[in-house]
């Protein structure tokens, strides 16, 4: 049977702004004209989706208009960005991989990403 | 608490269609896959069909495709299977069950009984 | 299509024994994509196991689940009465999903 392996970035960091990106890559056992891309995050053992989005093999990914996930697609990479995360965001984020269609259906889930977040010091008031 | 309640079961005669619902609840309906598995009497477990998401995507066992059709209603949290050109050993008890996120099957229904005889 | 024999067809125990019900795989089941679940009479199926050997939330740690490739056991350290019962292994992530033929632990 052949398998179906998602690679991912052990660790990111988010920026001063709370943005944080990761590839997301997919060895495709066989040829997927429609894929599906999940990012669930991990933490204390309680998982949640945070966003999903599926495309058409050469057109771009499209999240919802409410999401804070952007992506793009190039092959079997998907380059995500995760944005407005705070400290409290801080955990194991998994990209989840199926290929919808045509049959037969696979299913491929990474390790994780874990993405570190730290919240901005705040602006000292400056004496004039 | 999820709940899966199947209904629409019932005797039919070979040849003819039968229409199985399923109400979900307790669970965003339209995040997960969900599959009908059947059981006939003092038999095992036979996966039958599973849709996607969206519903676009579905996916048959070679012993229903081309006379089963898989469906579901996003905005009414249900699910459906149109069974037609029914046999006799399509007799089964047939199970409502959710894809978890990591793919197997973590919620069942108690399922509905269709029985083919003439 | 990946095919799933399971064995013993029926083991026949008393409570307090060990139960080790194998299920094999006609080819490797990729990324451990195998579950196993508990049928009573009249009742749908339970989920035991997941990912070969992850315990379902709830599912008491005398049931346990090993193995890799093509040979997986599920594992009953000490069967109590609740737990005579059929057992199914399953294996996911590639449609079409397969079910095993089922191994029946009955109390001897």
């Known amino acids: 049977c052949k398998a179906m392996h998602v690679a991912q970035p052990a660790v990111v960091l988010a920026s001063s702004r709370g943005i944080a990106s990761f590839v997301c890559e997919y060895a495709s056992p066989g040829k997927a004209t429609e894929v599906r891309v999940t990012v669930l995050r991990q933490a204390d053992s309680q998982v949640t989706e945070v966003c999903a989005a599926t495309y058409m093999m050469g057109n771009e990914l499209t999240f919802l208009d409410d999401s804070i996930c952007t992506g793009t697609s190039s092959g079997n990479q998907v380059n995500l960005t995760i944005q407005g995360l705070r400290a409290m965001d801080t955990g194991l984020y998994i990209c989840k991989v199926e290929l919808m269609y045509p049959p037969p259906y696979y299913l491929g889930i990474g390790n994780g990403t874990q993405i570190y977040v730290i919240d901005p010091e705040p602006c000292p008031d400056s004496d004039f | 608490q999820v709940q899966l309640v199947e209904s629409g079961g019932g005797v039919v005669q070979p040849g003819r269609s039968l229409r199985l619902s399923c109400a979900a609840s307790?669970?965003?309906?339209?995040?997960?896959?969900m599959h009908w598995v059947r059981q006939a009497p003092g038999k095992g477990l036979e996966w039958v069909a599973v849709i996607w998401y969206d519903g676009n995507n579905k996916h048959y066992a070679d012993a229903v495709r081309g006379r089963f059709t898989i469906s579901r209603d996003n905005s009414k949290n249900t699910l459906y299977l149109q069974m037609n050109s029914l046999r006799a050993e399509d007799t089964a008890v047939y199970h409502c069950?959710?894809?978890?996120?990591?793919?197997?099957?973590?919620?069942w229904g108690q399922g509905t009984l269709v029985t083919v005889s003439s | 299509e990946i095919v799933l024999t399971q064995s013993p067809g029926t083991l026949s125990l008393s409570p307090g024994e060990r139960a080790t019900l194998s299920c094999r795989a006609s080819q490797s089941v990729s990324s451990n994509y195998l579950a196993w679940y508990q049928q009573k009479p009249g009742q749908a199926p339970r989920l035991l196991i997941y990912g070969a050997s992850s315990r379902a939330t709830g599912i008491p740690d005398r049931f346990s689940g090993s193995g890799s490739g093509t040979d997986f056991t599920l594992t009953i350290s000490r069967l109590e009465p609740e737990d005579f019962a059929v057992y199914y292994c399953?294996?996911?992530?590639?449609?079409?999903?397969?079910f095993g033929p089922g191994t029946k632990v009955d109390i001897k």
């Open positions: 307790g669970f965003t309906f339209s995040s997960y896959g």
């Open positions: 069950v959710r894809g978890g996120i990591w793919g197997y099957f973590d919620y």
């Open positions: 399953l294996r996911y992530g590639t449609s079409p999903f397969t």
